[in-house]
C-alpha cells in the first residue's frame, strides 16, 4: 500500500478515502514533496506581511514585509519596524545612535566606530551616526619622517629661515 502513495507527486496527496488515489491539493493548500498523505495549508500574507510569491499546488506562499518594516527570522516569520540610518529600534521606538556609534542600515543596532589607532591607522573621514569612520594610512605609513633626512639645510634667506 505504501508503494501506491509513494507514486503521488508533489501537488497531490494520497487520499485514504479513495483507495489511495492521488488527489490534487485543494485550493489554498500545497504539497512540496511526493508521497504526502495531506496537503499543507498555504501561508497567508496579511497585515504587515505582503505576498512575495503566490502559493501554488507545489510550493507555499512567500511573504515580505510592507514598506516601513523588514523581515526577521527564517522565511520572514516576523516583521520589525524600520528605523532611519543613524538610529536603532528600542522598546520605546527608534532612537538616534549615541555619539561614537553608527548604523548604516534601517535595521539592526548602532555599532561603535572603528578605532583606527588599534590597527596603527589614522582617521581619514570622521564617523557620523550613519557612517563608520574611514581609516587610512598613518603618517608613518607615508614617509619615515625627518628620520629619513640629512640634517636640515641651514637658512639661506633673510627673514625666511626654516622653523
Amino acid at each position: 500500500l505504501q508503494d501506491l502513495c509513494s507514486n503521488c507527486p508533489a501537488g497531490t496527496f494520497c487520499d485514504n478515502n479513495r483507495s489511495q488515489i492521488c488527489s490534487p491539493c485543494p485550493p489554498n493548500s500545497f504539497s512540496s514533496a511526493g508521497g504526502q498523505r495531506t496537503c499543507d495549508i498555504c501561508r497567508q500574507c496579511k497585515g504587515v506581511f505582503k505576498t512575495r510569491k503566490e502559493c501554488s499546488s507545489t510550493s507555499n506562499a512567500e511573504c515580505d514585509c510592507i514598506s516601513g518594516y523588514h523581515c526577521l527570522g527564517a522565511e520572514c516569520s516576523m516583521c520589525e519596524q524600520d528605523c532611519k540610518q543613524g538610529q536603532e529600534l528600542t522598546k520605546k521606538g527608534c532612537k538616534d545612535c549615541c555619539f561614537g556609534t553608527f548604523n548604516d542600515q534601517k535595521r539592526g543596532i548602532c555599532r561603535p566606530w572603528t578605532n583606527c589607532s588599534l590597527d596603527g591607522k589614522s582617521v581619514l573621514v570622521n564617523g557620523t551616526k550613519e557612517r563608520d569612520v574611514v581609516c587610512g594610512p598613518s603618517p608613518a605609513d607615508l614617509s619615515p619622517g625627518a628620520s629619513s633626512a640629512t640634517p636640515p639645510a641651514p637658512a639661506r634667506e633673510p627673514g625666511h629661515s626654516p622653523q
Epitope: P137, S143, P144, G145, A149
Partner: antibody
Framework: QVQLKESGPGLVAPSQSLSITCTVS????????ISWIRQPPGKGLEWLGV???????NYNSTFMSRLSINKDNSKSQVFLKMNSLQTDDTAIYYC?????WGQGTSVTVSS | DVVMTQTPLSLPVSLGDQASISCRSS???????????LHWFLQKPGQSPKLLIY???NRFPGVPDRFSGSGSGTDFTLKISRVEAEDLGVYFC?????????FGGGTKLEIK
C-alpha cells in the same frame, strides 16, 4: 574632509620670486609632513622639498639655493618661496600630504 | 638621488584586460625602520595625482581591489586585474624612503 589648497600668483616675471600658500584642513600640520611637488607642462613630477612635523626642512639639492619652505601650525598654512624664477620654472605647483594632494596652482614665468 | 625607472612608457590595453607596470629603483627602498616607502599614484587629465597603493602593496581606502601592488628591495609592480575606462591616465611610482623623494617618469595607460 582632508583638504589642501594652494593659492599663488599665476604669472611671475623672470628673475622674480614666487610665493605660494597652502592652506590645509581636516588634519594638523603637527601630525603630517607637507611636501611641495611641481609638474612642468606635459612632464613628470619633481619633488621640491618637505617641511617635517617638527618644522625642520629638506630640499631637493637642485633648488636648495633658491627655495624656502615655512609653516604656521596655528593657521594650518604652509608657505613656499622660490627666488630667481626662469621660464623653465613654469609648472603646476602642488602642496602634498602624500596621500592627499592639493588641486595645484598653475605658475607661468613670462615677461 | 634615487632614480626610479618605470616601464613601459605607454601601455595600450583593451578594457577588461590585465595591465602590469614595472618600477625599478637605483638602490634599495627598504628604510632602516624596516618599511619600504614605495607608493603608486594615478593622474587623470587635468587632475592632481591620487594615491592608489602605499608601502608597496597596501590599497588606499576607496581604491578598487582590481589594483594590487607587489615587489621588494628595488623591483616593484602595479597590476590592474581588469582594466576599466576610469583607470585610464598616467601612473607614477614614488619613493619616500630617501630624501630627495623621487618619482618614476610615468606610464600612460590608454585604450588599444
Amino acid at each position: 574632509q582632508v583638504q589642501l589648497k594652494e593659492s599663488g600668483p599665476g604669472l611671475v616675471a623672470p628673475s622674480q620670486s614666487l610665493s605660494i600658500t597652502c592652506t590645509v584642513s581636516g588634519f594638523s600640520l603637527t601630525t603630517y609632513d607637507i611636501s611641495w611637488i611641481r609638474q612642468p607642462p606635459g612632464k613628470g613630477l619633481e619633488w621640491l622639498g618637505v617641511i617635517w612635523t617638527g618644522g625642520g626642512t629638506n630640499y631637493n639639492s637642485t633648488f636648495m639655493s633658491r627655495l624656502s619652505i615655512n609653516k604656521d601650525n596655528s593657521k594650518s598654512q604652509v608657505f613656499l618661496k622660490m627666488n630667481s624664477l626662469q621660464t623653465d620654472d613654469t609648472a603646476i605647483y602642488y602642496c602634498v600630504r602624500v596621500d592627499y594632494w592639493g588641486q595645484g596652482t598653475s605658475v607661468t614665468v613670462s615677461s | 638621488d634615487v632614480v626610479m625607472t618605470q616601464t613601459p612608457l605607454s601601455l595600450p590595453v583593451s578594457l577588461g584586460d590585465q595591465a602590469s607596470i614595472s618600477c625599478r629603483s637605483s638602490q634599495s627602498l627598504v628604510h632602516s625602520n624596516g618599511n619600504t616607502y614605495l607608493h603608486w599614484f594615478l593622474q587623470k587629465p587635468g587632475q592632481s595625482p591620487k594615491l592608489l597603493i602605499y608601502k608597496v602593496s597596501n590599497r588606499f581606502p576607496g581604491v578598487p581591489d582590481r589594483f594590487s601592488g607587489s615587489g621588494s628591495g628595488t623591483d616593484f609592480t602595479l597590476k590592474i586585474s581588469r582594466v576599466e575606462a576610469e583607470d585610464l591616465g598616467v601612473y607614477f611610482c614614488s619613493q619616500n624612503t630617501h630624501v630627495p623623494w623621487t618619482f618614476g617618469g610615468g606610464t600612460k595607460l590608454e585604450i588599444k
